[in-house]
Interface confidence: low
């Protein structure tokens, strides 16, 4: 049946899917607060532009009876059930904000003729790449993959004079939703990362990881894993580590490394942490005050989704264009808008661009220091610390294969 969009005559509605299965275990109340704060800002901006219109959100809740795992495993059907609910109510907003699980987003995109934009805080997996009406406001796996390949190939920095072509990937199946899809992308045999590496092995058992740390016959000195320092400590403990081992710890949505009073524990000295450049350090709004850093990024993505819609609505209204058209549905990409925490850039495929930051532990100060930054928009690395106080010999990152000479 034809679902009418509540999206004209000066009244514009956002459909927000409030799914029990979510990329992050965030109370729905916090997401509601984020959406409402976003709505207030959008109303102010539209009013400021002389556009006298109404913008509201409708929160669509699933019954939670069937799909109650709380994580993303049973999200596929929940997303479709919510769409069915919208269909039965014969009511759809101008835009759909909601599915954060890769499974649900992929299935919803596949099973519906989407003539409206879909904005996601999540949907990290490669299967959600290159979707014409999908916008993702948290860094997807593709962006991580491109950084890693770029960094592996780099060999002209004072602290990295070897290009790398090998890696171990630690993936034990207990990862959070973001980590699951990041590592999944690295594991996939057809992915860009796998294509560019000569050797890559996935370590699935704790013991495999622990053995590699001192194995003289290891095939690579580099191990990629995903999670926070505590996750690494649980796995590695205080075990001895060969001096040319480099652990890359992917921990994108955690800005605790940048806090003034943080000291890096000793077990982090062989580790490079990949995280996102923190949002404006002054951000601590009413909606985010009680959130952990990861959850704040998740709630912030919801809020920015509302601001993105407001940005597009303003443009289309100022140009006198219709909102319920394929043109509007396909417009949420290749642009920069004013997000809550500063400008937000979306690439040609509607995926958020960001500045990734690679940190190391200074052996002098025991503090995390920025080694380099990487701009996902231009796929370019910018060295920051040309004389890092590394734990590695000669303050240079080792070769990825022990005993191999200069490349």
């Amino acid at each position: 049946s034809q679902v009418s969009q509540n999206c004209h005559n000066g009244s514009y509605e956002i459909s927000v899917l409030m799914m029990g299965n979510s990329a992050f275990a965030e109370p729905l109340k916090n997401l509601e607060d984020a959406v409402n704060e976003g709505l207030e800002i959008v109303r102010g901006r539209l009013q400021n532009a002389g556009l006298n219109v109404t913008v509201n959100a409708t929160f669509m809740y699933s019954d939670g009876l069937i799909h109650n795992s709380g994580d993303c495993r049973s999200s596929t059907c929940e997303g479709l059930d919510l769409l069915r609910k919208i269909s039965n109510a014969q009511r759809m907003g101008c835009v759909l904000i909601g599915p954060s699980c890769t499974y649900s987003t992929f299935q919803m995109y596949l099973d519906t003729e989407l003539s409206y934009p879909m904005i996601s805080a999540g949907s990290f997996g490669l299967s959600c790449d290159y979707k014409e009406t999908l916008t993702r406001l948290m860094s997807p796996a593709r962006k991580l993959m491109y950084f890693l390949v770029n960094f592996w190939k780099t060999n002209d920095l004072p602290f990295k004079t070897y290009s790398w072509s090998t890696s171990y990937v630690y993936k034990n199946g207990t990862e959070t939703e973001d980590c699951f899809w990041y590592l999944n992308a690295l594991e996939a045999s057809v992915s860009y990362f796998s294509h560019e590496l000569g050797f890559k092995v996935v370590l699935r058992q704790d013991k495999e990881f622990q053995d590699i740390l001192m194995d003289h016959n290891r095939k690579s000195n580099v191990i990629i894993m995903c999670g926070g320092p505590e996750f690494l400590y649980k796995l590695k403990g205080d075990r001895a580590v060969a001096e040319d081992i480099v652990i890359i710890l992917v921990d994108l949505f955690n800005d605790q490394y940048f806090e003034d009073n943080v000291t890096a524990p000793d077990y982090m000295k062989n580790v490079l942490v990949l995280t996102l450049s923190p949002g404006n350090s002054l951000l601590n709004s009413s909606f985010s005050r009680n959130l952990s850093p990861t959850k704040r990024d998740f709630a912030l993505a919801y809020l920015n989704g509302i601001l993105l819609f407001g940005h597009m609505l303003k443009i289309f209204l100022e140009n006198g264009e219709n909102i319920t058209t394929p043109k509007f549905a396909h417009a949420f990409r290749n642009l920069t808008f004013e997000g809550y925490d500063g400008p937000v850039t979306l690439d040609d495929w509607g995926d958020v661009d960001s500045t990734m930051v690679l940190l190391y532990t200074s052996v002098d100060t025991k503090k995390y220091k920025v080694l380099l930054t990487y701009d996902t928009h231009v796929n370019k690395t910018y060295p920051v610390d040309m004389s890092p106080t590394f734990t590695w010999k000669n303050s240079k990152l080792p070769n990825d294969i022990t005993g191999r000479g200069p490349q």
Partner: nanobody, 115 residues
């Protein structure tokens, strides 16, 4: 119509104090994070201090311990108490939303610190 009206500036000797006010209208004031900015007209403005809708505050390093930002959500007004003023605090002071400064700028209020 959104309006931001800054007041309270003036000429003061080094070490002196001023209290700036930012009266707003046409916005749902209590929901916004607001900031005090300063700069010469037409030049890049720098953030001096900001206060969230919930009352959390942050300050630029150059004013920490000397300036205090506050707000009255009933009066839709924000304040900046400036103590121990220094010559380098001389500027036009503006209020706006943070981040993004998405409201039209007001006229600002001139603060001059000189002996």
């Amino acid at each position: 119509q959104v309006q931001l009206v800054e007041s309270g500036g003036g000429l003061v000797q080094p070490g002196g104090s001023l209290r700036l006010s930012c009266a707003t209208s046409g916005i749902i004031f209590h929901i916004y994070t607001m900031g005090w900015y300063r700069g010469a007209p037409g030049k890049q403005r720098e953030l001096v201090a900001r206060i969230t809708s919930g009352g959390d505050t942050n300050y630029a390093d150059s004013v920490k311990g000397r300036f205090t930002i506050s707000r009255d959500n009933v009066k839709n007004t924000m304040y900046l108490q400036m103590n121990s003023l220094k010559p380098e605090d001389t500027a036009v002071y503006y209020c706006n939303r943070f981040p993004g400064a998405t409201f039209s700028w007001g006229q600002g209020t001139q603060v001059t610190v000189s002996s």
